[in-house]
């Protein structure tokens, strides 16, 4: 049985940059069982976790992971040096910053050491798998009587990120959202001084330095509100 599975995952280019291959085997046996898919995410270009569902194996198996970079100076096969475990069974591998090369094709191979011919290889574009840390230090400035400006910081180069700002008042049932580019500034031109507002932001490694689909976690919310008393209409900022 010789299987090649093409699996587009939103990370494809003109040629698929993600595919699984299983080695041919002579008979239907354990060797023919597909290996779990490996999912890799690069966190803030500080480290990368490549994980798989170890519970999908018919019996507990310490699968091994090897990796290399295709057509590059880093094409030497490397063994995982830092495994992640789930109930004492390997379920992932963590790679450190020095082992991450964003713009080279990353090849990851999962193998069953008890059945060496049972292996699967995937090719990934790591620049499309970066997840930045959540935005920090949200601040609000009153530009005019009715206009607010929201600023924040990221622990990554600003020009590599785009952002999504969400805000709502205590009277709203849903969030209003606005996309913001690498300049990472957002202004709300019309603020009702009688309402309390909540703002939050998330960021994504797109479109300049990569084409990531996954957003960061949401920032801690920041609030801007009004005392209900008519005698004291001053606005104030509170960080949650």
């Amino acid at each position: 049985l010789n299987t090649t599975i093409l699996t587009p995952n939103g990370n494809e280019d003109t040629t698929a940059d993600f595919f699984l291959t299983t080695m041919p085997t002579d008979s239907l046996s354990v060797s023919t069982l597909p290996l779990p898919e490996v999912q890799c995410f690069v966190f803030n270009v500080e480290y990368m976790n490549c994980t798989w569902n170890s519970s999908s194996e018919p019996q507990p198996t310490n699968l091994t992971l090897h990796y290399w970079y295709k057509n590059s100076d880093n094409d030497k096969v490397q063994k995982c040096s830092h495994y992640l475990f789930s109930e004492e069974i390997t379920s992932g591998c963590q790679l450190q910053k020095k082992e991450i090369h964003l713009y080279q094709t990353f090849v990851v191979q999962l193998q069953d050491p008890r059945e060496p011919r049972r292996q699967a290889t995937q090719m990934l574009k790591l620049q499309n798998l970066v997840i930045p840390w959540a935005p920090e230090n949200l601040t609000l400035h009153k530009l005019s009587e009715s206009q607010l400006e929201l600023n924040w910081n990221n622990r990554f180069l600003n020009h590599c990120l785009e952002h999504l700002v969400q805000y709502r008042t205590d009277w709203d049932h849903s969030w209003t959202e606005q996309s913001v580019d690498y300049r990472h500034k957002f202004s709300l031109p019309s603020v009702d001084g009688q309402k309390r507002y909540t703002f939050r932001v998330r960021s994504r490694f797109n479109p300049l330095c990569g084409s990531a689909q996954h957003w960061s976690e949401w920032s801690h919310p920041i609030h801007w509100g009004s005392n209900t008393s008519k005698e004291n209409p001053f606005l104030f900022a509170l960080e949650a």
Partner: nanobody, 117 residues
Framework: QVQLQESGGGLVQPGGSLRLSCAAS????????MTWARQAPGKGLEWVST????????AYAASVEGRFTISRDNAKSTLYLQLNSLKTEDTAMYYC??????????PGQGTQVTVSS
């Protein structure tokens, strides 16, 4: 061996224009975003602009936005920076770098831009 060779700098009057070029070799140029940075005398390295690998997205430092234009020709493995409406504060050594400008790898030799009347 990654090589980046900048050219096109020179002496120009305020309000003038220049076009900088960066010839790249030794890596898959079309796979990488590319960045221009500059270093004024006695100052640190300042990010100027970055362009996506396919040229479809660009970003600029606030100090140059609207005056500078980054572009690339992947067929020629060359990066460009068009400098218009130059100011004296644009005087610096200009470097191109592979990637998004995180400081690595080291920039090339650079090309000097001097804006003076």
């Amino acid at each position: 061996q990654v090589q980046l060779q900048e050219s096109g700098g020179g002496l120009v009057q305020p309000g003038g224009s220049l076009r900088l070029s960066c010839a790249a070799s030794g890596f898959s140029f079309s796979s990488y975003p590319m960045t221009w940075a500059r270093q004024a005398p006695g100052k640190g390295l300042e990010w100027v602009s970055t362009i996506a690998s396919d040229g479809g997205s660009t970003a600029y430092a606030a100090s140059v936005e609207g005056r500078f234009t980054i572009s690339r020709d992947n067929a020629k493995s060359t990066l460009y920076l068009q400098l218009n409406s130059l100011k004296t504060e644009d005087t610096a050594m200009y470097y191109c770098t592979k990637g998004y400008g995180d400081g690595t790898p080291a920039p090339g030799q650079g090309t000097q831009v001097t804006v003076s009347s």
